[in-house]
């Protein structure tokens, strides 16, 4: 059943989440900028077909529209999405020495955000079952594929975060 924005989420949790989304968006933008500057891979829309063939998935947030937000489902989808992106970012490891530190920080920040979401779900008695394993992750056959994958994963992640931010901001409104 839908739960309105005045649902049982503490303001401190929502503000922490908004902070974390902004931090990850900054990390993601830095990764995109470096991929563009170093490898001239600047337009994710040009790589969409390659993304399909590589099998890079999207994370849904269908339980999160502000008009009919289902709190448990939305938080669960947020957590599942972050779990998915942890795996996708892990698949990019070794992308290049120049991008390594940025990717490392992005990976940890995504993991920390997933922890924050899970912690709150646990406090509300709605923690999901632990996902035992990652689903099938894309296998990159070449350096180019890995870098192109980096552009797409960063782009998908940014889209996911934009929706997340809107949802969290909506929930944070009194």
């Amino acid at each position: 059943t839908p739960l309105g924005p005045a649902s049982s989420l503490p303001q401190s949790f929502l503000l922490k989440c908004l902070e974390q989304v902004r931090k990850i968006q900054g990390d993601g933008a830095a990764l995109q900028e470096k991929l563009c500057a170093t490898y001239k891979l600047c337009h994710p829309e040009e790589l969409v077909l390659l993304g399909h063939s590589l099998g890079i998935p999207w994370a849904p947030l269908s339980s999160c529209p502000s008009q009919a937000l289902q709190l448990a489902g939305c938080l669960s989808q947020l957590h599942s999405g972050l779990f998915l992106y942890q795996g996708l970012l892990q698949a990019l490891e070794g992308i290049s020495p120049e991008l390594g530190p940025t990717l490392d920080t992005l990976q940890l920040d995504v993991a920390d955000f997933a922890t924050t979401i899970w912690q709150q779900m646990e406090e509300l008695g709605m923690a999901p079952a632990l996902q035992p394993t990652q689903g099938a992750m894309p296998a990159f056959a070449s350096a180019f594929q890995r870098r192109a994958g980096g552009v797409l994963v960063a782009s998908h992640l940014q889209s996911f975060l934009e929706v997340s931010y809107r949802v969290l901001r909506h929930l944070a409104q009194p």
Epitope: K16, E19, Q20, R22, K23, Q86, D104, D112, E122, L130
Partner: antibody
Framework: QVQLVQSGAEVKKPGASVKVSCKAS????????MHWIRQAPGQGLEWIGY????????NYNQKFRDRATLTADTSTSTAYMELSSLRSEDTAVYYC????????????WGQGTLVTVSS | DIVMTQSPLSLPVTPGEPASISCRSS???????????LYWYLQKPGQSPQLLIY???NLASGVPDRFSGSGSGTDFTLKISRVEAEDVGVYYC?????????FGQGTKLEIK
């Protein structure tokens, strides 16, 4: 309450390896990253790396990338830090500390494990 | 890597007097989200470090309010308004803006 209990002190010869354990209790272990930090005698703190137990992903400080291996066993809620090709400069107290964001970061530490490397 | 530099390295203080420790980072720790990713830890003799202050100025749970943190993007200060005997130990600043996380060399506070 959250507790991190580390294995006991170790004495190793140069060139050997050491494996330190950190058993967690009082929280859902796979959900939090676990970091490892060391402190040489009379020195400051040095970040070694972290493990994300939920996906088995580890990340290392460049300085330790060739010699450190971080692992986690979710069935026993235990994190491990293995350091190979030990040298005298590796003599230090090794700590595990639970990760997180904001007020959660390194809010919980193990008691430390002294590793002495001596011939 | 971001380099964290503390001063002084040793700080003798009379109980009841104020104390101040400085920390400087080689890169701004102020993120575009408005948060400064600077932490302070205290390691009491024979103990593991404990969290004192997070995100430059927020007091960790259970930390007495005689402790306070302030600063800008690269220059930070930990203040103790009135030092007590239990405050002795080594104080570390640390950054968690980006990996690898790095710590200052530590400031040893001792009672005169």
């Amino acid at each position: 309450q959250v507790q991190l209990v580390q294995s006991g002190a170790e004495v190793k010869k140069p060139g050997a390896s050491v494996k330190v354990s950190c058993k967690a209790s009082g929280y859902t272990f796979p959900i939090y990253t676990m970091h490892w930090i060391r402190q040489a005698p009379g020195q400051g703190l040095e970040w070694i790396g972290y493990i994300n137990p939920s996906i088995g992903y580890a990340n290392y400080n460049q300085k330790f990338r060739d010699r450190a291996t971080l692992t986690a066993d979710t069935s026993t809620s235990t994190a491990y830090m293995e350091l190979s090709s030990l040298r005298s400069e590796d003599t230090a107290v090794y700590y595990c500390a639970r990760g997180g964001y904001g007020d959660s970061l390194f809010a919980y530490w193990g008691q430390g494990t002294l590793v002495t490397v001596s011939s | 890597d971001i380099v964290m530099t503390q001063s002084p390295l040793s700080l003798p203080v009379t109980p009841g007097e104020p104390a101040s420790i400085s920390c400087r980072s080689s890169k701004s720790l102020l993120h575009s989200n408005g948060i400064t990713y600077l932490y302070w830890y205290l390691q009491k003799p024979g103990q593991s470090p404990q969290l004192l202050i997070y995100q430059m100025s927020n007091l960790a749970s259970g930390v007495p309010d005689r402790f306070s943190g302030s600063g800008s993007g690269t220059d930070f200060t930990l203040k103790i308004s009135r030092v007590e005997a239990e405050d002795v130990g080594v104080y570390y600043c640390a950054q968690n803006l980006e990996l690898p996380y790095t710590f200052g060399q530590g400031t040893k506070l001792e009672i005169k």
